[in-house]
């Protein structure tokens, strides 16, 4: 339909592909990419080819290529500014002759190891109540947090650690769109930190 | 046989506008871009544009918006350029070419003298 | 826009001899495509796509390189290959051409 929008999740620095899926290459003239302005319009390579690109944009210069027989699209060395809506008029030699396919890019930072930091609320009858964050290094859209074995969600963990909870091991995972990355920390460490008057763990 | 006969010298006024047109035979028009070079007496080419019939998209060079209005007519497989505002500067040799990949084939070149 | 710039500008080869021309872009591009013009004559497509000859070069002709460096060579040269040699990037909007190298027989 060409009413739909079809998002494409893309890594900072990485390359990303728009899906176009032509079924009969051969009937294909001209693909024209827009966004906020021409992007770049692709034709039909030779028999020996792929698509042959012409960028129209220089933000775009040697970033682009397409892909045959089917097309799609390839943008390399994504910058946070490529992130948009961009559209694909394809004028092919047959009815409907012009179709649209639109797109929604998103760009996102591969994550790095997040930072578990901790404070203590309280420490009575050898139980130690601690609160534990989880944070990411520069602030990300779209990044969830997941904390196991508990299963909870949230960057913030409230934990009542026993004599008995030692051997276990709390491990934060921070998620986008595109990269997962984790760290843990022992309840043996932790209580042991708070015991010294540590607040902070990171193994990264 | 591909062949691209281009409209005939032009000798015209300054500050004047002309046309010149490219006639395509031998490949589908309206599959390939058809592109436009100047070259002048002695020096190399410049290109200005080009026009793909088949969607009516075109590029142009920064330096000859304004100067030039590329545009095609399907149905008689011809491709124009119209140049205005001319100035003895825009006295040349222009040809057409026409490709997907590079330019695979040239008119023959029309010749434009501007002079008063 | 990207700027090509053809070295040298005019040379001269005896027959025989291996000739080697180069187009240097002022930043990187996929491939050039050489054109041959002959005085008084439409530019002719000769290598594409770098180092793909046209139909009817001769064998002699050869493209090479990548990014910003490429060249046109001709292994032995002969007198019909007196004429002004071109480059051109395609990829990138403006379509731009070099400054030609004139390669003359001695």
């Known amino acids: 339909k060409d009413s739909e929008i079809f998002t494409v999740n893309g890594i900072l620095g990485e390359s990303v592909t728009f899906p176009v899926n032509i079924q009969e290459p051969r009937q294909v003239k001209i693909i024209a990419w827009t966004s906020k302005t021409s992007v770049a319009y692709v034709t039909p390579g030779d028999s020996e080819t792929a698509p042959v690109v012409t960028v129209t944009h220089r933000n775009y210069y040697e970033r682009i290529h397409a892909l045959g027989p089917n097309y799609n699209l390839v943008i390399s060395d994504l910058r946070m500014e490529d992130a948009g809506d961009y559209k694909a008029d394809i004028n092919t030699q047959a009815d409907p002759y012009t179709t649209t396919k639109r797109y929604n890019l998103q760009i996102y930072r591969r994550l790095g190891k997040p930072k578990i930091t901790q404070s203590l609320m309280a420490s009575v009858n050898s139980t130690c109540n601690v609160t534990l964050t989880c944070s990411v290094e520069k602030e990300e859209k779209n990044v969830t947090y997941n904390w196991s074995p508990l299963g909870e969600e949230g960057n913030v963990l409230q934990i009542f650690q026993t004599p008995e909870d030692q051997e276990l091991t709390y491990t934060c995972t921070a998620q986008n769109p595109v990269s997962n990355n984790s760290d843990s920390i022992s309840a043996r460490q932790l209580c042991a930190d708070i015991a010294m008057g540590f607040r902070t763990h990171h193994t990264g | 046989q591909v062949h691209l006969q281009q409209s005939g010298a032009e000798l015209v006024r300054p500050g004047t506008s002309v046309k010149i047109s490219c006639k395509a035979s031998?490949?589908?028009?309206?599959?390939?871009?058809l592109g436009w070079v100047k070259q002048r007496p002695g020096h190399g080419l410049e290109w200005i544009g080009d026009i793909f019939p088949g969607g009516g998209y075109i590029n142009y060079h920064e330096k000859f918006k304004g100067k030039a209005t590329l545009t095609a007519d399907t149905s008689s497989s011809t491709a124009y350029m119209q140049l205005s505002s001319l100035t003895s500067e825009d006295s040349a040799v222009y040809f057409c070419?026409?490709?997907?990949?590079?330019?695979?084939?040239w008119g023959q070149g029309t010749s434009v003298t501007v002079s008063s | 826009q990207i700027i090509l710039t053809q070295t040298p500008a005019i040379m001269s080869a005896s027959p025989g001899e291996k000739v080697t021309m180069t187009c240097s872009a002022s930043?990187?591009?996929?491939?050039v495509h050489w054109y041959q013009q002959k005085s008084g004559t439409s530019p002719k497509r000769w290598i594409y796509?770098?180092?793909k000859l046209a139909s009817g070069v001769p064998a002699r002709f050869s493209g090479s390189g990548s990014g910003t460096s490429y060249s046109l060579t001709i292994s032995t040269m002969e007198a019909e290959d007196a004429a002004t040699y071109y480059c051109?990037?395609?990829?990138?909007?403006?379509?731009?051409f070099g400054g030609g190298t004139k390669l003359e027989i001695k």
């Open positions: 930043s990187s591009v996929s491939y």
């Open positions: 051109q990037q395609w990829n990138n909007s403006p379509r731009t």
């Open positions: 031998g490949y589908t028009f309206t599959n390939y871009w």
């Open positions: 796509d770098t180092s």
């Open positions: 070419g026409y490709g997907n990949i590079a330019m695979d084939y």
